[in-house]
Interface confidence: medium
Amino acid sequence: AWELTILHTNDVHSRLEQTSEDSSKCVNASRCMGGVARLFTKVQQIRRAEPNVLLLDAGDQYQGTIWFTVYKGAEVAHFMNALRYDAMALGNHEFDNGVEGLIEPLLKEAKFPILSANIKAKGPLASQISGLYLPYKVLPVGDEVVGIVGYTSKETPFLSNPGTNLVFEDEITALQPEVDKLKTLNVNKIIALGHSGFEMDKLIAQKVRGVDVVVGGHSNTFLYTGNPPSKEVPAGKYPFIVTSDDGRKVPVVQAYAFGKYLGYLKIEFDERGNVISSHGNPILLNSSIPEDPSIKADINKWRIKLDNYSTQELGKTIVYLDGSSQSCRFRECNMGNLICDAMINNNLRHTDEMFWNHVSMCILNGGGIRSPIDERNNGTITWENLAAVLPFGGTFDLVQLKGSTLKKAFEHSVHRYGQSTGEFLQVGGIHVVYDLSRKPGDRVVKLDVLCTKCRVPSYDPLKMDEVYKVILPNFLANGGDGFQMIKDELLRHDSGDQDINVVSTYISKMKVIYPAVEGRIKFSTGSH
C-alpha cells in the first residue's frame, strides 16, 4: 500500500493576512486565524513529518480584499509560489479582471500547474494562452506519480469576465476523456481538482470513471468528522464518500473558505491504484499555530502599498451620499441606490442576444449601509470612505429566486417598520410600493421588476412562479437580518465580488457620481 497526504485549500478569496473568526479583518491578533504565514507553518510541519504530500488549491484565490484590488493577482502568484503549491484549479473569480488579468499576473508567474479540463480557448486567444493552463498534470510524488485533472464552473461566463474566446464545457463531459488519457499513460492514481461546487463534485465522483478523489471548491462547503472546532456547521462527514456508478467508494472533500482551514486528507492506495482507505479532517488554522516569521515579514512588506492605496481618490461625488440609518432603514436612500447600481453594473454580461443582461435586480439590507459620505470634502471618495460604508468585508452574490420568495422578502422588509431595523431593503431594478396601514405580511401593494429578456428595459409586475436572478449581499443570501426565506428557498447561489471593490470600481469608472432618490421605494395611502 502507498499513502498520499492531500493538503487543500479553496475559495481563499484574497485572505493573505490572518483574519477574525468570521474571516473579516483581524482585530484581536490573539484570536485571529488563517493567513498564508500560518498556513505555511502547518504545511511545512506536515511536509517534514510525512513522505508523500501534495498541496492543492481548488480555485478562487482571486477577489475578496484590498490585496486583490491593489495587486490584481501578483500577490496570489507570489505567495502561492512561496508556499510551493503543487497545483491549482481555475475558479470563476480568476477571470474577474478578464483573461489578461489572469494570464499576466498568475498564469505566467505561477511555478505550479494551473488546471482546467473544461475550459477551451478559441480564436486568437488559443495560441496566446496555449500551455499557460492545462487540462491535467502528472506530478511525481515520492516513487509514484499522481494525475491531477482540473475543472471550473461552467457558469463562469455569468459570474465573471472570461470574454468570448473561452468556452466552458460541461464538467463531466470534458473530464472523462482527460481521465481516460491519464489511464493510457499508466497513471492509476487520479485526483479531480476543481471549482464547480459540492453538488457537481459529488456528480464527478459518481460519473467520471477513473477519478479516485475529488477536491472541490466554489460552494464554501465545510465537511467535518467529529465535533467541529469553530462556528462552521458541517454539511457532512470529511471525507464525504460517494459510491461511483462503477461501484467504487470515492472521497470528496472541500475546506470551507477564506484560508481558515487547511484540508487534510490521507489516502491509501493499493498497487493497482485503487483507494483502500481515506480519512482526515480540515485543520483549523487558529492562533495556536504560529505565523511563519519569514512569510509574515514578507506580508508586512507587501502590506505597505495597501495602506497608501486606501487614501487615494477613486472618484468624486457632487451630492451628499446619504448612508445614514435614519434614511436607509426607513426609506429609499441615495447611498443604497448607488450601491445597487454598482452591483448591477458589476454584473453586466451580454451572453445572449435575447437579453440585454442576465440580471437586472438588486436588493440590499439598509442595515448593511453603515455611513454616509459628505461631498463637502472636495467631493473626494476614497477606499477608506467606502470601508466605513461597507465595513463587514462581504460579497455581492448572484442568486436565483422565485417571485414568491421575493414577495416574502419585501414583506419581511417592512414587517416591523419604524423601529430602525436593518432589514429595510434598498433596491435596484425594482419598484416597490408599501401600504403600512395594512397588517404585517400584507404590506406590499405593488412590486414591479425590470425585464431582462427585452431590448428596451421596462418594469413589469412580479410573477410569483417565475425564476428571477437577483444580486444581493452574501449576508442576505445566508438568511441574515431574518431573511430566512431567501436562504431556504433560493434555487442557486454563486458568491460574487468583494462589496467595497464593486462600489470602488463603479465610482472609478463613472469618475463623477450624483445618485438621486428617484421613487424606487414608495409608500401609499399618504402615510409617507
Epitope: H78, P105, S294, D298, K305
Partner: antibody, heavy 119, light 108 residues
Framework: QVQLVQSGAEVKRPGSSVKVSCKAS????????ISWVRQAPGQGLEWMGG????????NYAQKFQGRVTITADESTSTAYMELSSLRSEDTAVYYC????????????WGQGTTVTVSS | SYVLTQPPSVSVTPGKTARIACGGN??????VSWYQQKPGQAPVLVIF???DRPSGISERFSGSNSGNTATLTISRVEAGDEADYYC???????????FGGGTKLTVL
C-alpha cells in the same frame, strides 16, 4: 527562461562611484527580489542589499548603508547598484541575483561584473 | 546581527557522503538556502527552503534544518562536486540576507 545580464567590467579610482546594471529578461520583474552580492578575491559571498521593484524601496546591509544605492526601472526590467566613495577593498565581483523573496533562495544569478578600484 | 558559521573545509573521497554544517542561533526558525560555487563562476542554488532542490539539481544533494544546525548532504560524491558551498538565510528581524563564510569541499 529568466536571465539576468549585467553590465561590463569597470576600473575606478578611489573616491569615485560605480553603477552596475542588471537587466532581467524572460519573466516578470516587478514582484521578485533582486539582491546584490559581492565577492572580493579569495573571499566569500557578501550581501549588499536588495530591492523588490513593486515596492520601490531598497534595503541595505548595515556595512554599506549610506554608500550604496539600489534602484529598479520597471519599464526596462533593469536593476542598478551604485557604490560611492570607492576604496581598494571594494575590488570584487558584483553579482545580481533574483528570487521570489529574500527567504526563497536566489534561483537566478547574473554573470557577475568585475569592479577594480585602483589608483 | 545574525551570524551563520560554516567549517572552512571538508574533505571526502569519491563515492562517499559529504556533510557540510551551517550553524546559527535557533536556525530551524529560519529558511535555509545552499549555493555551490565553482572557481570563476557565479553561485548556483542547490537547496532552498531547507530541503528543496531546484529543477536540474541532482537528487544526490539534500538538505535538513533542525535546532541550531542546517546540513547540506551530498551523497555518492563525484569529482565535479568539488566547489565552495555557502549557506544563506534571511533574517526577518533586520530584513537582511546573511551568508555563511563558505566551506571548501575537496574531493580526494
Amino acid at each position: 527562461q529568466v536571465q539576468l545580464v549585467q553590465s561590463g567590467a569597470e576600473v575606478k579610482r578611489p573616491g569615485s562611484s560605480v553603477k552596475v546594471s542588471c537587466k532581467a529578461s524572460g519573466g516578470t520583474f516587478s514582484s521578485y527580489a533582486i539582491s546584490w552580492v559581492r565577492q572580493a578575491p579569495g573571499q566569500g559571498l557578501e550581501w549588499m542589499g536588495g530591492i523588490i521593484p513593486i515596492f520601490g524601496t531598497a534595503n541595505y546591509a548595515q556595512k554599506f548603508q549610506g554608500r550604496v544605492t539600489i534602484t529598479a526601472d520597471e519599464s526596462t526590467s533593469t536593476a542598478y547598484m551604485e557604490l560611492s566613495s570607492l576604496r581598494s577593498e571594494d575590488t570584487a565581483v558584483y553579482y545580481c541575483a533574483r528570487g521570489v523573496s529574500y527567504y526563497y533562495g536566489m534561483h537566478v544569478w547574473g554573470q557577475g561584473t568585475t569592479v577594480t578600484v585602483s589608483s | 546581527s545574525y551570524v551563520l558559521t560554516q567549517p572552512p573545509s571538508v574533505s571526502v573521497t569519491p563515492g562517499k557522503t559529504a556533510r557540510i554544517a551551517c550553524g546559527g542561533n535557533n536556525l530551524e526558525s529560519k529558511i535555509v538556502s545552499w549555493y555551490q560555487q565553482k572557481p570563476g563562476q557565479a553561485p548556483v542554488l542547490v537547496i532552498f527552503y531547507d530541503t528543496d532542490r531546484p529543477s536540474g539539481i541532482s537528487e544526490r544533494f539534500s538538505g535538513s534544518n533542525s535546532g541550531n544546525t542546517a546540513t547540506l548532504t551530498i551523497s555518492r560524491v563525484e569529482a565535479g562536486d568539488e566547489a565552495d558551498y555557502y549557506c544563506q538565510v534571511w533574517d526577518s528581524n533586520s530584513d537582511h540576507v546573511i551568508f555563511g563564510g563558505g566551506t571548501k569541499l575537496t574531493v580526494l
